[in-house]
Interface confidence: low
């Protein structure tokens, strides 16, 4: 008698290892004999697919070499035309030994940055990932963590994090090890011992000492007033990633000496700087034998520049000090007619304050020289090009009179405003700061020979100049 199909052995979940055989059995009772078809994830398995073997009139489905992608729901459907078709389904769970699909690679990282060593794995059950550093299991802490992906993340990398690492993927079926990789920690150049400033007598020998460290070991170069050191002997030694450099100098003039430690990280360089000043005893103290007197400025040329009602020093070595000093300024100002609009107001302020120095009244009236920082600001920032031209002309004797030489101060011989709060005069009209300067393109390729500090802003400024000079 005709009999509708009945599945007597329903499909069950089958566990199989990759590359092994997996078989589903779908036993059917019926008359006439049924036609049995198989699906995986609702997609028909073709009879001629060579990855499968279908036997026993379709009741046995064998996957000949299980792959990771064979995971899914397998169903058999039996139909013989009597009654309805019947179906039974079961799952194939592909079990897989751990496999590292993205192993870690060698890493060079700068101290303080974040390092990530990848370790992406496959496996079923999902492998747990741990890491080995050297020969010991790596312990996680607030800086070091194994991510969900298996990758190792190290925050704020330290020198001691350098070493050999490998990741380990483990599940119930086995363990996989990555190859050993190297984490190299590079450290920015850092100065451990900076050169010390010295106040010495003319003709002394001085040794400046600079010690630096870094990974790789930095090189040390010495700069004198912005240029490579031209004289003096340098001795260097390297020990335990520390470089020690000694510069021996014969002192004939004051100078700013900078030790620069540099090391390379890939295509980039890191540098550390430390500076020392060599000053010559008595070099910049004001002379005590100034002959002159204090009086209010009554001229015309410097009216807009000198502070109102300021006392100025009138030098009695001239027969008529007021007239002689006014003439000096007048001569110098004529030369300024051709300079740039950036330079001119700064130069005018400098010249007026240099020729009509601020006067400190007292038993001995004392002219107060301009602070070195303001002089350097004019020379190196506002009027860099013009100053070079002027110095050239002076050397070649192109100026009409010797008077002009008196109108340009020699900045290096002026006192610093930080040596003593009253030892030098500020230029109230010269108001600038480094932040302004950074926003302008370079005006000249020449860099300042010293790092000019910020000048204090003046509340009485009648103009503010932002020179086109790059401080970077």
């Amino acid at each position: 008698l005709p009999k509708a199909p009945v599945i007597t052995t329903p499909l069950e979940t089958v566990d199989a290892l990759v590359e092994e055989v997996a078989t589903f059995m779908c036993a059917v009772e019926s008359y006439p004999q049924p036609e049995i078809s198989w699906t995986r994830n609702k997609i028909l398995i073709k009879l001629f697919d060579t990855r499968y073997s279908i036997r026993e009139n379709g009741q046995l489905l064998t996957i000949l070499s299980v792959e990771d992608s064979d995971d899914g729901i397998y169903c058999c459907t039996a139909n013989n035309g009597v009654g309805g078709a019947v179906e039974s389904c079961g799952a194939l769970q592909v079990k897989m030994k751990p496999k590292i699909t993205r192993p870690p690679i060698n890493v060079k990282i700068i101290e303080g940055l974040k390092a990530v060593l990848p370790c992406t794995t496959m496996g079923n059950p999902k492998p747990s990932v741990s890491w080995i550093k050297g020969d010991s299991p790596l312990r996680e802490n607030s800086r070091i963590a194994v991510l969900e992906s298996g990758s190792l993340r190290i925050h704020n990398v330290q020198k001691e994090d350098a070493g050999q690492y490998r990741c380990v993927a483990k599940n119930s079926l086995g363990t996989a090890y990555s190859k050993v990789v190297k984490l190299e920690v590079e450290v920015f150049a850092r100065i451990l011992r900076a050169p010390e400033s010295h106040n010495v007598t003319f003709g002394s020998f001085v040794t400046l000492h600079c010690t630096a460290t870094g990974i790789p070991v930095p090189t040390i170069t010495w700069i004198e007033n912005g240029n490579a050191v031209s004289s003096g002997s340098i001795q260097e030694s390297v020990k335990d990633r520390v470089i020690d450099s000694r510069l021996q100098l014969f002192i004939t003039k004051p100078g700013l000496y900078t030790c620069i430690a540099t090391n390379k990280h890939g295509e980039k360089f890191s540098t550390a700087k430390a500076a020392a000043t060599i000053s010559i005893a008595e070099w910049s103290k004001p002379q005590k034998d100034n002959k002159g007197y204090c009086a209010q400025y009554r001229g015309e040329v410097c009216n807009a520049v000198l502070a109102k009602d300021a006392l100025v020093f009138l030098n009695t070595s001239y027969a008529d000090p007021e007239e002689a000093q006014e003439l000096l300024v007048h001569t110098a100002w004529n030369e300024l007619k051709v300079v740039s609009p950036v330079c001119r107001p700064a130069a005018e302020a400098l010249l007026c304050n240099h020729i009509f120095q601020e006067c400190s009244p007292g038993v001995v009236p004392t002219p107060i020289p301009i602070c070195r920082e303001y002089c350097l600001a004019v020379k190196e920032l506002f009027c860099a090009k013009e100053w070079l031209v002027m110095e050239e002309k002076t050397h070649r004797g192109l100026y009409r009179s010797e008077m002009h030489l008196l109108s340009v101060p020699e900045c290096s011989k002026l006192p610093s405003m930080h040596w003593d709060p009253t030892a030098c005069a500020r230029l109230p009209h010269l108001d600038y700061n480094k932040e302004n300067l950074k926003t302008f393109p370079p005006m000249t390729s020449s860099k300042p020979s010293v790092d000019i500090p910020n000048l204090p802003s003046s509340s009485s400024s009648s103009f503010s100049v932002s020179p086109t000079y790059s401080m970077t």
Epitope: S197, A275, E373, S416, W419, D451, N454
Partner: antibody, heavy 124, light 107 residues
Framework: EVQLVESGGGLVKPGGSLRLSCAAS????????MNWVRQAPGKGLEWVSS????????YYTDSVKGRFTISRDNAKNSLYLQMNSLSAEDTAVYYC?????????????????WGQGTLVTVSS | DIQMTQSPSTLSASVGDRVTITCRAS??????LAWYQQKPGKAPKLLIY???SLESGVPSRFSGSGSGTEFTLTISSLQPDDFATYYC?????????FGQGTKVEIK
């Protein structure tokens, strides 16, 4: 090692005088400006006076002008404060302090080294 | 004279805390400001000069910032040795003046 040691403090009657000394060692005394700073019992710090390395520049706080005199003897590595017309308001620990310039030579660094202080008590 | 005002006068904190002390000047002193630490019965110790320059030998947990009239001293992670009184001082112009002090005590 830099050392500053004050001496000369003690009990004095109002209107009286006292001379404080500060002995310096461990650095080239003649190259540094020196200062006196005081601290009344349980109160804050108050700058009193400063003198430059060659005694060219001398400064006082307003309340001591005309009464106190700062001086130094570079040959003896010593700093002094002569205090006259003392009053109860001058009661304090008096510290001698050095200053310097940083490595650039541009920037002034105030009071980088201090002595242990000497107590001046003005009371009748 | 330039007046210096510190706040707070007293500050209670625990080891590991980030501590900030403020100092205000009655007029602009650009960056000419120093910070000192003083422990009972001891002389003050210079920590910071020029508003933000760390004095040699001072731990890097101390930092200074500000310019003009507003300045701050920050201790990034308070240590047992840091419980003391802190003073700011302007050296922009004579007379040089100190703040009234901020006492940092254990909470």
């Amino acid at each position: 090692e830099v050392q500053l040691v004050e001496s000369g403090g003690g009990l004095v009657k109002p209107g009286g005088s006292l001379r404080l000394s500060c002995a310096a060692s461990g650095f080239t005394f003649s190259s540094y400006s020196m200062n006196w700073v005081r601290q009344a019992p349980g109160k804050g710090l108050e700058w009193v006076s400063s003198i430059s390395s060659s005694s060219s520049y001398i400064y006082y706080t307003d309340s001591v002008k005309g009464r106190f005199t700062i001086s130094r003897d570079n040959a003896k590595n010593s700093l002094y404060l002569q205090m006259n017309s003392l009053s109860a308001e001058d009661t304090a620990v008096y510290y001698c302090a050095r200053d310097r310039y940083d490595r650039s030579g541009y920037y002034y660094v105030p009071f980088d080294q201090w002595g242990q202080g000497t107590l001046v008590t003005v009371s009748s | 004279d330039i007046q210096m005002t510190q706040s707070p006068s007293t500050l209670s904190a625990s080891v590991g805390d980030r501590v900030t002390i403020t100092c205000r000047a009655s007029q602009s002193i650009t960056s000419w400001l120093a910070w000192y630490q003083q422990k009972p019965g001891k002389a003050p110790k210079l920590l910071i000069y020029k508003a933000s320059s760390l004095e040699s030998g001072v731990p890097s947990r101390f930092s200074g910032s500000g310019s003009g009239t507003e300045f701050t001293l920050t201790i990034s992670s308070l240590q047992p040795d840091d419980f003391a009184t802190y003073y700011c001082q302007q050296y922009n112009s004579f007379s040089w003046t100190f703040g009234q002090g901020t006492k940092v005590e254990i909470k």
